[in-house]
């Protein structure tokens, strides 16, 4: 029986009768929040095998081991995740052993095993046979391994029963619990999963099968399960579903989500049954199951009941992502907030009509309207007293209305209105009147002359480099000497530069009036020797990474014919030289027979530049003879129990830190202090733990259905 | 608070035909899909027609398909089931529901769980 959509068991431990004939759950399984210990010996759920999502433990009081649960789990497919994990335990106080001992395969995604102060057999696990990389589980905070003392089965008696594997160069047994071993298939079966017997099962298998090369006979499928047997690709007529398995036209046609309160239907689109068209697709008309593409942003119509949406803050913003034609008018006014230019930009970037006026006052925040990036139409359809459709008041720090080299607007019906924005010269007005259409529709007191662009430089000079030198994290620029018309107006430059991927940005890219800004800024000053030009050295940059670089004239504000002059450069894109990448990720070596290594590994975080070939070295290793690290016959040897309390694992440090013997005469030492990037590195770690445990009491405390 | 009430139900010769309405409020109507129900005596609720809110999109029953069309008026904040060539077996209590959120995955559009709010029910009697 397929269970779902998505299994949530808490508060009572009885729900977990709801297991019962579940042989998959199509979605994820919680098991949480169950503060009363309980005896779940009599629980029991043989036939559950598969997990297509991810499986979430936590605080679940009583629970010691998983294995008489689900004796049978085999395959967590990982199809959604949890912040990026198929397998969370967490706080699980009573938890002594995993022993999902029939886990074979995590197909996607890494674990969490968290702050769970009794879990041992942790070290046993060789979680590379489960998952494909396991550089991303995150395993910290349970019984320390020496308070553990972890036995696999039959090494006390002598006769080990389980096989060995190295993890971190330690060759060692494998197994769940003390009496069940970790189960591996021969290596002549490659990649392909085993039963029992070690038989291999068919290569469509995962995990595992009851009969060999049999596609009929597996516990799960590598690909998709379709009328009894696994496939590869999904037949025709049929459609891929939930990542897992196939389903036909009629089964998809009479779907619903369950997360939407409206009952639009799923669709087919690219041989998958799936909830939404996928970005950059829509419905094909209104009882159409299938997605054509858009031509630009996929239309979404969002309409304002009060006719007038205000957009004061982020979280008004918030309301219109994804809108590309807004019914209705839009008041602008945003006196603070925090990064609010990208924010706005997030939320509102891809309006491209709007059916009324636009207004913004008070806008003292914003310093450009490049936010309303994708806005080519305003109708006009409604205006404001006066027949304004555009109207721009009050607005302190605003200098551009929109690139106009870059951008067509559209102003249908209606005049323009600006009046009191001190920063925002009348020539980035009038060219606004030329672009949108509506140049002869204002009268004269519409496009105040005094009071636009009073405090701006809005006559400009253009400063020019004159060199650039690049190295793989360093640019030296240098550029014009400029000379305004009294030299003593000059007081010195300010290098504006960033990391640009593409030749896109613009001066006021994620700029805002609150101290926002994507550039970083360094000042220079004037060479005191007037024949030498100015330049900069940037430094601490990434190498083989193209940058964005302008260069602004800081000047007195020397008002001349009502205007200051001005001078800064076009925007220059420089890349840095390529350097040594980082080291490769995640390398995993195996050995697929007795004179053979496979060996495999990701691309390196930072390439550093074009990547044309990679070197692998190996040596011949001594065989480590130390096989036993402790000697459990003797009881002196046996490390003294203690109860782990949950918290992360950090050496406890005895009254005499003095522990390092130092090499030669001269005695015991203190434990070096940390340095600072191991300093940052606990920091960031102390702060991902905490965005982790935020994520997960936000995902799970929720308001209790009406 | 959510109202649903049904009205037009009667009883009706075989071959004939009725209209069910179903005034809502107390919701954003034009947000909400909606769904019409029927439970014959002794028998277990089915779905009869269900339709989305944002692009009208419509679902049936295979006992009812061409015979019945659901529709829906924003503006009145109403639900309609045109019922033509009524049969004996039609007779029921027909209800009317407001989809709901209901956690994850999916659900079938007749399965009574994906909906929060019902009304009272019209009775429609099919008898000559």
């Known amino acids: 029986e397929i269970c779902g959509p998505g299994i949530d068991i808490r508060n009572d431990y009885q729900q977990l009768k709801r297991l019962e004939n579940c042989t998959v759950i199509e979605g994820y399984l919680h098991i949480l929040l169950i503060s009363k210990a309980e005896d779940y010996r009599s629980y029991r759920f043989p036939k559950l095998t598969v997990i297509t999502e991810y499986l979430l433990l936590f605080r679940v009081a009583g629970l010691e081991s998983l294995g008489d649960l689900f004796p049978n789990l085999t395959v967590i497919r990982g199809w959604k995740l949890f912040y990026n994990y198929a397998l969370v335990i967490f706080e699980m106080t009573n938890l002594k052993d995993i022993g999902l001992y029939n886990l074979r395969n995590i197909t996607r995604g890494a674990i969490r095993i968290e702050k769970n102060a009794d879990l041992c057999y942790l070290s046993t696990v060789d979680w590379s046979l489960i998952l494909d990389a396991v550089s991303n589980n995150y395993i910290v905070g349970n019984k320390p391994p020496k308070e553990c003392g972890d036995l696999c089965p039959g090494t006390m008696e002598e006769k080990p029963m389980c096989e060995k594997t190295t993890i971190n160069n330690e060759y060692n047994y494998r197994c769940w619990t003390t009496n069940r071993c970790q189960k591996m298939c021969p290596s002549t079966c490659g990649k392909r999963a085993c039963t029992e017997n070690n038989e291999c099962c068919h290569p469509e298998c995962l995990g595992s099968c009851s009969a060999p090369d049999n596609d009929t006979a597996c516990v799960a499928c590598r690909h998709y399960y379709y009328a009894g047997v696994c496939v590869p690709a999904c037949p025709p007529n049929t459609y891929r579903f939930e990542g897992w398995r196939c389903v036909d036209r009629d089964f998809c046609a009479n779907i619903l989500s369950a997360e939407s309160s409206d009952s639009e239907g799923f669709v087919i689109h690219d041989g998958e049954c799936m909830q939404e068209c996928p970005s950059g697709f829509i419905r094909n008309g209104s009882q159409s199951m299938y997605c054509i593409p858009c031509e630009g942003p996929c239309p979404k119509v969002c309409e304002e009941e009060k006719k007038t949406k205000t957009i004061d803050s982020v979280t008004s913003a918030q309301m219109l992502q994804g809108c590309t034609i807004f019914k209705g008018n839009l008041l602008i006014n945003i006196r603070r907030g925090n990064n609010i230019a990208s924010e706005l930009e997030n939320f509102m970037g891809l309006i491209e009509v709007v059916t009324g006026y636009v207004k913004i006052r008070h806008s003292h925040a914003l310093v450009s309207l490049s936010f309303l990036k994708n806005l080519r139409l305003i109708l006009g359809e409604e205006q404001l007293e006066g027949n304004y459709s555009f109207y721009v008041l009050d607005n302190q720090n605003l200098q551009q209305l929109w690139d106009w080299d870059h951008r067509n607007l559209t102003i249908k019906a209606g005049k323009m209105y600006f009046a009191f924005n001190p920063k925002l010269c009348v020539s980035e007005i009038y060219r606004m009147e030329e672009v949108t259409g509506t140049k002869g529709r204002q009268s004269k007191g519409d496009i105040n002359t005094r009071n636009n662009g009073e405090r701006a430089s809005c006559e400009s000079d253009v400063l020019h480099f004159t060199s650039t030198t690049t190295s793989k994290n360093r640019i030296i620029i240098t550029w014009h000497r400029y000379r305004p018309p009294d030299y003593r107006d000059l007081i010195s430059f300010t290098v504006y530069y960033k990391e640009a991927p593409f030749k896109n940005v613009t001066e006021y890219d994620g700029q805002d009036a609150c101290g926002s800004n994507s550039w970083n800024m360094v000042d220079v000053d004037l060479p005191p020797n007037k024949d030498v030009e100015p330049g900069i050295l940037l430094h601490g940059l990434k190498p083989w990474t193209q940058y964005a670089v302008y260069v602004k004239a800081v000047t007195l504000t020397m008002v001349e014919n009502d205007h200051i002059r001005g001078a800064k450069s076009e925007i220059l894109y420089i890349r840095t030289n390529a350097s040594v990448p980082s080291i490769p990720l995640d390398v995993l070596s195996a050995s697929n027979s007795s004179s053979q290594l496979i060996v495999k590994w990701n691309p390196p975080s930072l390439p550093n530049g074009n990547l044309s070939y990679y070197i692998v070295r190996w040596q011949r290793q001594p065989q480590d003879g130390y096989l036993y690290r402790h000697n459990y016959c003797s009881k002196d040897k046996i490390p003294i129990r203690k109860y782990a309390d949950g918290t992360i694992d950090i050496e406890e440090v005895t009254e005499n830190p003095k522990t390092e013997v130092c090499g030669g005469e001269k005695g015991p030492c203190c434990a070096c202090p940390k340095t600072e990037a191991e300093k940052q590195a606990e920091k960031e770690e102390a702060e991902y733990r905490k965005v982790f445990e935020n994520f997960l009491h936000n995902s799970i405390f929720v308001p209790r259905p009406e | 608070e959510v109202q649903l009430v049904e009205s037009g139900g009667g009883l009706v010769q075989p071959g004939g035909s009725l209209r069910l309405s179903c005034a809502a409020s107390?919701?954003?109507?034009?947000?909400?899909?909606m769904a019409w129900f029927r439970q014959a005596p002794g028998k277990e609720r089915e779905g009869v027609s269900a339709?989305?809110?944002?692009?009208?999109?419509?679902y049936y029953a295979d006992s009812v398909k061409g015979r019945f069309t659901i529709s829906r008026d924003n503006s009145k904040n109403t639900l309609y089931l045109q019922m033509n060539s009524l049969r004996a077996e039609d007779t029921a209590v027909y209800y009317c529901?407001?989809?709901?959120?209901?956690?994850?995955?999916?659900?079938?559009?007749?399965?009574?769980?994906?909906?929060?709010?019902w009304g009272q029910g019209t009775l429609v009697t099919v008898s000559s």
């Open positions: 529901a407001v989809r709901s959120k209901n956690g994850a995955g999916y659900g079938f559009w007749y399965e009574a769980r994906l909906y929060g709010y």
């Open positions: 107390g919701f954003t109507f034009g947000t909400f899909g």
């Open positions: 339709i989305s809110a944002s692009s009208g999109r419509t």
